[in-house]
């Protein structure tokens, strides 16, 4: 029959090659000459040429040694054709199974494996898993079946069998109690992997087991008693550093100390923190100590670790005796910050207030006073009594020195101790407003058209406080009311300025008097630029031929003509004419275009 059973070929065959494996035979060879061929991976496709066939005999040939670890099975097709090339059989499956030889040693996946386990753990605790691979077959043979074992352990303390390894999984576990990091921090195991399930080739590797720290050592004070001297009143003063030793891993939570004051600090005067580098307890004052109240404190300090203890351990306690040293204390102003109401503008020499300090020391010390900071130089202070008087004019509206009606002064008290000490106090003068400022309009320069002019709204400001401000009243003075009107709005905080008669293009002064609710009057001159235009304007259109200064000049054009015609004499004429024109400016403007202005205003 045109069938071939699976062919088993051992890997790593010695040859000689080509090696005959099996003969393909078609029973059609009785009728015609048959030519045989094979196809498939290993024959005519990669890896080409592993197998061949003798075309006329049908012998299947192996051309080279096989490697099961590279290709474990080849699937080929056998073909039979007659002399004329016609196929005489269907393609036949040829299975070539490569059988395994134990040609590979086990290989550990790492040269060195690293694992860790907590000190003091119970036997049976898993540490780590090691792995060795073997490329040989582990399904049909034992060639690739790996068995693990521990060859040696270093050090052999407390004895030489602290660990075991599972022969098939490679899991390393603790087998004995007594792991103590403080005695043996690390074990080095030489491990073996042997194929043929322990009867074949062996390879070795190293497993390093780190013993992890458990908090099985309490911190201990060295020494246990401390004595310290601290000046009174100092906050944040380092009183004492307390030192501990701990056998656990430095800088770990099991080593880092946590300190607590467990007695002797009823007034909550002290705090203790852990120094991050030295692990010492740094005892400092949280509040100033008062020698006069208590000259000695006996503190009890307990130490634990950041991490809880892994086993039951005693807690260490230290005693710190703190002696308070007397110091000359500074006088203290009562209150430290004093608020006084005083009217602005009071006469020089007028008393403002008395501001005194007390000395905490038991001795009756003499206190003298002086002003430390008085930005405007408005005050003086009696050195003996602490009486504060005005020596300058207190001005609430002085924005350089006064903020939100308050003028701030710093005063100093000095005792006569040895050495003398000083204390400061803050005097906050709340200045009461008086009506010492009149209202002022903003802006003080306007530009307006002389035809269909737009009303100019000016804001009114008054530096004083209510009721010395709005409502305001407005009045035009110095004949300004001939050409202008000024009206205060309903709210009384703006004034509306309007041009009521035609004025030629020029600059004019409008005299505006404003008074506040307390009848404080303020005269302001508004500079009005009148332009030849209609409605709203920002700047005058066209070439500006405005006059000079407050009066302005109406004779610019004439002056130019006169200069052209007469030369030197023209200068004198121009001066004369200019002066006359300037004086008669408002009258000339009125006569010139009275008719046109009349039409505009009526419109």
């Amino acid at each position: 029959d045109w069938v071939v059973a699976p062919i088993s070929v051992p890997e790593n065959g010695k040859g000689p090659f080509p090696q005959r494996l099996n003969q393909l035979k078609s029973n059609k060879d009785r009728d015609t000459k048959i030519f045989y061929s094979i196809t498939g991976p290993g024959a005519d496709s990669p890896p080409e040429g592993v197998f061949a066939v003798e075309k006329e005999t049908g012998w299947l040939l192996l051309n080279k040694p096989l490697d099961r670890e590279e290709i474990a099975k080849y699937e080929l097709f056998g073909h039979a054709v007659s002399e004329n090339g016609a196929s005489v059989e269907d393609p036949m499956n040829i299975s070539i199974i490569v059988t395994d030889q134990n040609d590979h040693k086990p290989k550990f996946t790492q040269d060195t494996f690293r694992g860790s386990v907590l000190e003091g753990v119970l036997p049976g605790t898993s540490v780590m898993q090691v792995t060795a691979t073997d490329e040989d077959d582990a399904i049909y043979t034992y060639n690739g079946v790996v068995a693990y074992s521990i060859h040696s352990q270093e050090p052999k303390d407390p004895h030489d069998l602290m660990f075991t390894i599972h022969r098939s999984t490679g899991t390393i576990s603790v087998i004995s109690s007594g792991l103590d990091r403080e005695k043996v921090p690390e074990y080095t195991l030489t491990i073996q992997a042997t194929d043929m399930d322990g009867d074949g080739s062996t390879t070795t590797a190293v497993a390093v087991v780190e013993i992890l720290d458990a908090n099985d050592n309490a911190p201990m004070f060295e020494p246990q008693k401390y004595e310290a001297w601290v000046p009174e009143n100092e906050v944040g003063h380092e009183v004492q550093r307390l030192t501990v030793t701990d056998l656990d891993v430095p800088n770990s939570p099991a080593w880092r100390a946590t300190y607590h004051i467990v007695g002797g600090d009823d007034g909550d005067h002290f705090t203790i923190t852990t120094h991050p580098e030295t692990n010492q307890g740094v005892l400092t004052t949280k509040k100033g100590l008062d020698f006069e109240a208590q000259d000695q404190h006996t503190l009890y300090v307990e130490v634990t670790n950041e991490a809880p203890f892994a086993v039951k351990l005693p807690t260490a306690t230290a005693t710190v005796v703190v002696h308070v040293k007397d110091v000359n204390e500074a006088p203290v102003f009562v209150p430290p910050s004093k608020v006084v109401e005083v009217q602005e503008g009071i006469p020089t020499g007028e008393p403002v207030c008395v501001y005194t300090a007390e000395d905490p020391d038991k001795e009756n010390q003499k206190i003298s006073y002086r002003i430390l900071r008085d930005p405007a130089g408005w005050l003086a202070m009696d050195p003996d009594s602490g009486q504060v008087t005005a020596v300058g004019t207190l001005d609430r509206e002085d924005e350089q020195f006064v903020r939100n009606n308050i003028y701030e002064v710093m005063v100093l008290a000095m005792d006569n101790g040895s050495p003398p000490t000083t204390g400061t106090g803050t005097l906050l003068l709340t200045l009461i407003d008086v009506n010492d400022h009149g209202p002022v309009p903003e802006p003080r320069q306007i530009t307006i058209c002389n035809q269909s002019p737009v009303r100019q709204v000016l804001n009114i400001t008054d530096k004083d406080l209510s009721p010395h401000t709005s409502p305001f009243q407005a009045q035009l003075t110095d004949d300004s009311d001939i050409y202008w009107t000024a009206e205060v709005n309903e709210e009384g905080d703006t004034v509306v300025l309007s041009l009521k008669k035609f004025l030629k293009q020029d600059t004019y002064d409008v005299h505006l008097s404003l008074s506040d609710h307390g009848n404080k009057e303020q005269l302001t001159v508004i500079r009005a630029t009148v332009c030849d235009c209609h409605g709203h304007v920002e700047t005058c259109p066209g070439p500006w031929k405005g006059g000079s200064g407050g009066g302005g000049s109406g004779a610019g054009v004439i002056a130019v003509i006169v200069v052209v015609v007469i030369a030197i004499v023209a200068g004198i004429v121009v001066l004369v004419i200019s002066r006359k024109k300037r004086m008669a400016k408002y009258e000339k403007a009125e006569i010139k275009e009275m008719g046109e202005m009349h039409r505009e205003l009526n419109a």
Epitope: E48, G49, L61
Partner: antibody
Framework: VQLVEESGPELVKPGASVKISCKAS????????MNWVKQRPGKGLEWIGR????????KYNGKFKGKATLTADKSSSTAYMQLSSLTSEDSAVYFC??????????????WGQGTSVTVSS | ELVMTQSPASLSASVGETVTITCRAS??????LAWYQQKQGKSPQLLVY???TLAEGVPSRFSGSGSGTQFSLKINSLQPEDFGTYYC?????????FGAGTKLEIK
């Protein structure tokens, strides 16, 4: 065993074709592979391809696919190689060489005397 | 394509001397290596196949060795008729490839 390349030296024009023959005697022609090898003047040997006359199976060097066509006539025990679209690069001596069938892994044990092909206009 | 590297490219020797020619394959060809001798204007002649088997009628002063990728042809006691060009050839995988040749000349 004897391989005789019967066609004498060939002088052909570029673009033309030439067919070289190789007559075998002294062995079973249809049961051995016939190889063809090219040698340019002063150069080494270059394998073109082979044919198994028994069933006409061919195998070519990729470089000569489309250039060389191998055929065999069992009745006259003659192998042929046709070279097409000739250029000056095809000017060479062409050898036929027998290879016994042993899974086609045998060396070429008998060689023809060679046919010289010159391509020139 | 498998590359065959032959060395030396040329070699001068005297009659009676022993010479060795080497051939390196770019991949494993096991023992499938042949050596040929070609004289000027003649066709190549098979000397050795399967790396070390001498072809019929080849004198025993010729010997082949090697396997895998490294091969050599040794000629003991050179004779005048041994001068010519020698080629190695892979007869394992197609395309069959030849070395570039070693030209052996009389010193």
């Amino acid at each position: 065993v004897q391989l005789v390349e019967e066609s004498g030296p060939e002088l052909v024009k570029p673009g033309a074709s030439v067919k070289i023959s190789c007559k075998a005697s002294g062995y079973a022609f249809s049961s051995s592979w016939m190889n063809w090898v090219k040698q340019r003047p002063g150069k080494g040997l270059e394998w073109i391809g082979r044919i198994y006359p028994g069933d006409g199976e061919t195998k070519y060097n990729g470089k000569f696919k489309g250039k060389a066509t191998l055929t065999a006539d069992k009745s006259s025990s003659t192998a042929y190689m046709q070279l097409s679209s000739l250029t000056s690069e095809d000017s060479a001596v062409y050898f036929c060489a027998r290879q016994r069938d042993y899974g086609a892994l045998y060396a070429m044990d008998y060689w023809g005397q060679g046919t010289s092909v010159t391509v020139s206009s | 394509e498998l590359v065959m590297t032959q060395s030396p490219a040329s070699l001068s020797a005297s009659v009676g001397e022993t010479v060795t020619i080497t051939c390196r394959a770019s991949d494993d060809i096991y023992s499938y290596l042949a050596w040929y001798q070609q004289k000027q204007g003649k066709s190549p002649q098979l000397l050795v196949y399967n790396a070390k088997t001498l072809a019929e009628g080849v004198p025993s002063r010729f010997s082949g060795s090697g396997s895998g990728t490294q091969f050599s042809l040794k000629i003991n006691s050179l004779q005048p008729e041994d001068f010519g060009t020698y080629y190695c050839q892979n007869h394992y995988v197609t395309p069959f490839t030849f070395g570039a040749g070693t030209k052996l000349e009389i010193k």
